[in-house]
C-alpha cells in the first residue's frame, strides 16, 4: 500500500482550520477545535 505523505506546512491567512476528533485521538467523531486569533486549532 502506498503511504500518504504529510507536509505539515500550512499557509493560513485568518482561515479556520477544522479537524475531525477521530484524527486527533478521540473516537467520538465530533468536530472539535480551539479558537486562537481567529484560527481553529486542535
Amino acid at each position: 500500500d502506498a503511504e500518504f505523505r504529510h507536509d505539515s506546512g500550512y499557509e493560513v491567512h485568518h482561515q479556520k482550520l477544522v479537524f475531525f476528533a477521530e484524527d486527533v485521538g478521540s473516537n467520538k467523531g465530533a468536530i472539535i477545535g480551539l479558537m486562537v486569533g481567529g484560527v481553529v486549532i486542535a
Epitope: 506546512g9 493560513v12 479556520k16 482550520l17 479537524f19 476528533a21 477521530e22 484524527d23 467523531g29
Partner: nanobody
Framework: EVQLVESGGGLVQAGGSLRLSCAVS????????MGWFRQAPGKEREFVGA????????YYAGSVKGRFTISRDGAKNTVYLQMNSLKDEDTAVYYC?????????????????WGQGTQVTVSS
C-alpha cells in the same frame, strides 16, 4: 501509487440532483480522510466538504450545507457526493482528494492525492 477516479458528473437542470463517485485504489482507504473540492472557471479551487475516516462525521462548506451529502463505502473503497437542489453557481469541475489523518479537513494543502476531476454543469 494512490489513485482517485471520479465519475458521475454531467449536465443537470437547476434544482436537480447528481451523485458523484470517487473510487480509491492503491492505498489504505480506512486510514485516510476524504474530501471534495470544486473549481469554477476563473476561480480558485474551493473546499466543498469532507468525511472522516470512519464515515461517521462530515463537514461542509456553508454554500452547500443542507444540499450536499458526503458518504463513504469501505467495502467498495468509494466516496460519494450527493448533490441536491443544484444551482447555477454549483457549476464547476469537482475533485475528490485524500489527506493523511491529523491534518485540517478544509485546507486544500492538507490533501496530497487528487482525482482528475469531473465536470458538473447546472443549467437554468
Amino acid at each position: 501509487e494512490v489513485q482517485l477516479v471520479e465519475s458521475g458528473g454531467g449536465l443537470v437542470q437547476a434544482g436537480g440532483s447528481l451523485r458523484l463517485s470517487c473510487a480509491v485504489s492503491g492505498g489504505t482507504f480506512s486510514s485516510v480522510g476524504m474530501g471534495w473540492f470544486r473549481q469554477a472557471p476563473g476561480k480558485e479551487r474551493e473546499f466543498v466538504g469532507a468525511i472522516s475516516r470512519s464515515g461517521d462525521s462530515t463537514y461542509y462548506a456553508g454554500s452547500v450545507k443542507g444540499r450536499f451529502t458526503i458518504s463513504r463505502d469501505g467495502a467498495k473503497n468509494t466516496v460519494y457526493l450527493q448533490m441536491n437542489s443544484l444551482k447555477d453557481e454549483d457549476t464547476a469541475v469537482y475533485y475528490c482528494a485524500a489527506r493523511p489523518a491529523g491534518t485540517p479537513i478544509n485546507i486544500r494543502r492538507a490533501y496530497n492525492y487528487w482525482g482528475q476531476g469531473t465536470q458538473v454543469t447546472v443549467s437554468s
